[in-house]
């Protein structure tokens, strides 16, 4: 009678993660007797998956029914199927022996690749916010994908970027992998309402990729452009001064009022309005009583946006001496104003 | 060389439950097969449990069969014995080991490695 063979029909299996993967096993012949065991990998570190004689497989069912006397079919379907299960699987007849049943014959062995799809990418900006013109980093990351070719693509406000470094790891042979990546985005004044997307495409999500994003408006600070007016005079001793807050984000901001170097008035912004682009403006004024000043007199805006150290504006209003003969018109005198840290 | 370390034991009713830890160090655990043994006194070291590298197949002595549950996490290196139901007759010294070949219940034959053991006392 011609030799027992056993038979491994598929060379290779592909399954998706979660599945079940079934793996093909024949034997030619009923003799000798003994059973069969399937291991993953070959050699004295393979891994025992199937034992017809005894052990618990949760996971693993026979296709049919092995305690049949007849049966030449020892196929089996793995269950729940995740990368960990990759690697090449054999299915072995042994011969009954005292006291071991010895290896008889082996089958070619059937590789068993699963594909597993990448987690959702998840996008991180800078710890801390950065102003426009500068350059501020982005990562994306996703995991738990195989086999290890994948694409990632970044994109601010719909444009394609250029400017990253992509990693898959690890380099070599893995039951899965992960990518890193990071993306250099230069600020404008105008990414108030800006988003980067990195978008991941993998074999497994059959052409729809997966995205993360990040919102630019979590990144960006636009410091504030400050301009002080003196309004036309109210009453014959009152000057009227504003501060124009424009153009600022995000809207923490604490605006302070000083004459000639003395506090006073403070104020946090609560009233703003929304540009379009999603900044800011607000506006403050300072009633001046001139009477109640021998000199001229020198009010700041001070203004603190987002615990930066203050800006502020200066604006000088000089004090005539007889205010009530110059006219109304002239209690005080805009001669300019200049810009400077006073910190 | 694989350094193996046992916790959890301790004394317990009859009927109570205990999870025995075992958490292996100084080799890539997702290449060892891993089993529970137990050595009653006066008596030889008797195989409890065993479990394969990835954690698909397990073996179980007939007497612990539906009591006991091996399993692995191995991100985390480690094994566990879930006792449950527990009687008298399992008080021993419980014993963790790891081989790098594995062949069912001959597991014992095939160790490589051994922890010191954690005491595991039931009274009635």
């Known amino acids: 009678e011609e030799e027992l063979q056993v038979i491994q029909p598929d060379k290779s299996v592909l399954v998706a993660a979660g599945e079940t993967a079934t793996l093909r096993c024949t034997a030619t012949s009923l003799i000798p007797v003994g059973p069969i065991q399937w291991f993953r990998g070959a050699g004295p570190g393979r891994e025992l998956i199937y034992n017809q004689k005894e052990g618990h497989f949760p996971r693993v069912t026979t296709v049919s029914d092995l305690t049949k006397r007849n049966n030449m079919d020892f196929s089996i379907r793995i269950g729940n199927i995740t990368p960990a299960d990759a690697g090449t699987y054999y299915c072995v007849k042994f011969r009954k022996g005292s006291p071991d049943d010895v290896e008889f014959k082996s089958g070619a062995g059937t590789e068993l690749s699963v594909r597993a799809k990448p987690s959702a990418p998840v996008v991180s900006g800078p710890a801390a916010r950065a102003t426009p013109q500068h350059t501020v980093s982005f990562t994306c990351e996703s995991h738990g994908f195989s086999p290890r070719d994948i694409t990632l693509k970044w994109f601010k406000n719909g444009n394609e970027l250029s400017d990253f470094q992509t990693n898959v790891d690890p380099v070599g042979e893995s039951v899965s992998y992960s990518i890193h990546s990071t993306a250099k985005v230069v600020l404008t004044r105008e990414d108030v309402h800006s988003q980067v997307i990195c978008e991941v495409a993998h074999v497994t999500l059959q052409g729809d990729p997966l995205r993360g994003t990040a919102n630019l408006s979590e990144t960006i600070r636009v410091p504030p452009t400050l301009e002080v007016t003196q309004q036309p005079v109210r009453a014959e001793n009152q000057v009227n001064v504003t501060c124009q807050v424009r153009k600022f984000y995000p809207q923490r901001l604490q605006l302070t009022w000083l004459e000639n170097g003395n506090v006073s008035r403070t104020e946090t912004a609560s009233t703003v309005t929304e540009n379009k682009d999603g900044t800011y403006n607000w506006m403050s004024w300072l009633l001046v009583n001139v009477s109640a000043h021998r000199d001229d007199v020198k009010l700041t805006c001070q203004v603190e946006h987002d615990g930066q150290p203050a800006v502020s504006k200066s604006h000088d209003l000089k004090v005539s001496a007889h205010p009530k003969e110059q006219g109304s018109n002239t209690a005080a005198e805009n001669t300019g104003s200049n810009e400077r840290n006073i910190y | 060389q694989v350094q193996l370390q046992e916790s959890g034991g301790g004394v317990v009713q009859a009927g109570d439950s205990l999870r025995l830890s075992c958490v292996a160090s100084?080799?890539?655990?997702?290449?060892?097969?891993m089993g529970w043994f137990r050595q009653a006194p006066g008596k030889e070291r008797e195989f409890v449990a065993g479990?394969?590298?990835?954690?698909?197949?397990?073996y179980y002595a007939n007497s612990m069969k539906g009591r006991f549950t091996i399993s692995r996490d191995n991100a985390k290196n480690l094994v566990y014995l879930q006792m449950n139901s527990l009687k008298p007759e399992d008080t021993a010294v419980y014993y963790c080991?790891?081989?790098?070949?594995?062949?069912?219940?001959?597991?014992?034959?095939?160790?490589?490695?051994w922890g010191q053991g954690t005491q595991v006392t039931v009274s009635s």
């Open positions: 080991a790891a081989a790098l070949t594995f062949r069912g219940s001959d597991l014992p034959r095939d160790s490589n490695y």
């Open positions: 100084g080799r890539t655990f997702s290449s060892l097969d």
């Open positions: 479990i394969s590298r990835s954690g698909i197949s397990q």
